[in-house]
């Protein structure tokens, strides 16, 4: 069964900077990736970026840079302008759409015990049952 993993890391040098990494584990080629925060897109979450393998990326503040890391993984750099670092308690969700298989999505957040510069393990946090 295909799976999506999400990891969130805080930059050691800039505590106001975060990076979200997402990847797709499964067959098929990715047609579109949607990254949102505060929940899944369409379920109360706010869209941060949309990445298309051929047509490029689109991003919305506070997203700073969205890019492909591999053919099946992406990263999104975020700039936290607030002093209180709200990203630390935020859920980030990634949805990978593959044609003609369909879509898979997962959410993750910065672990409470994370030290700056240490990345969270790439443990998938499925928002839907794995058998769907």
């Amino acid at each position: 069964t295909p799976e999506v993993w999400v990891q969130v890391q805080m930059e050691a040098t800039e505590l106001s900077s975060f990076t979200v990494h997402c990847g797709f584990l499964g067959p098929g080629s990715i047609s579109l990736v949607t990254v949102s925060w505060g929940g899944p897109d369409g379920a109360g979450g706010t869209k941060l970026a949309v990445l298309h393998p051929e047509l490029g990326t689109r991003q919305w503040a506070p997203a700073r840079q969205a890019r492909w890391e591999t053919q099946s993984s992406i990263s999104l750099a975020l700039e936290d302008s607030g002093a209180s670092s709200p990203f630390a308690n935020t859920t980030f969700c990634c949805k990978f759409a593959s044609f003609p298989e369909g879509s898979w999505e997962s959410c993750g957040s910065l672990p409470p015990s994370s030290d700056p510069g240490l990345s969270a393990p790439p443990t998938p946090v499925p928002i839907l049952r794995a058998d769907l």
């Epitope: 098929g28 080629s29 047609s31 579109l32 899944p40 897109d41 369409g42 379920a43 949309v50 298309h52 051929e54 047509l55 949805k95 759409a97 044609f99 003609p100 298989e101 369909g102 879509s103 999505e105 839907l128 769907l132």
Partner: antibody
Framework: DVKLVESGGGLVKLGGSLKLSCAAS????????MSWIRQTPEKRLELVAA????????YYLDTVKGRFTISRDNAKNTLYLQMSSLKSEDTALYYC?????????????WGQGTSVTVSS | SIVMTQTPKFLLVSAGDRVTITCKAS??????VAWYQEKPGQSPKLLMY???HRFTGVPDRFTGSGYGTDFTFTINTVQAEDLAVYFC?????????FGGGTKLEIK
Amino acid sequence: DVKLVESGGGLVKLGGSLKLSCAASGFTFSSYHMSWIRQTPEKRLELVAAINSNGINTYYLDTVKGRFTISRDNAKNTLYLQMSSLKSEDTALYYCARHEDYYGFAMDYWGQGTSVTVSS
Amino acid sequence: SIVMTQTPKFLLVSAGDRVTITCKASQSVSNDVAWYQEKPGQSPKLLMYYVSHRFTGVPDRFTGSGYGTDFTFTINTVQAEDLAVYFCHQAYRSPWTFGGGTKLEIK
């Protein structure tokens, strides 16, 4: 203007074969995923077969697997559906449609349809 | 496969009425739901994608809502030209499936 024009439908005997074509124009055909959808006499819609933009990945409805083959020629801007071992339940109006990645793979344009009737 | 149960099958309304069609998925389909309109003698046309986004040129009297398994499609102030069959569709997981359709007739 996006245009999809199906052809190749007709009356065919049980167990016979037919090849449907869909000529695309008004857009970059090679950038879009495509599919064949049929509407049964009871007006039910079924996605019969789908193919991704480069023609590598395909999908088939269980009831047509092994009998139907979807293909595309990006140089000719044409989508095909080769149908063989036709059954009476394949009688339907067959549409080709374009999928839009940015719309959650919704089918944003459909052709006018071509009718397939399988008779005994 | 995911079953999309669409209700009602038939609607008889007067011009100016508000119409609501529902679609229930047998399992979560996220927000990957589209709605199509098929007028007599025409091929289906996309009205809504990602549940609530109107396709180009679709009047704002058409709205959609929902997430997961329960979806609603509404026509506010029905007009005579809305006479058609409406279908919901999930493109979340293959096999992609359609609802059974709702035939809208105007009194």
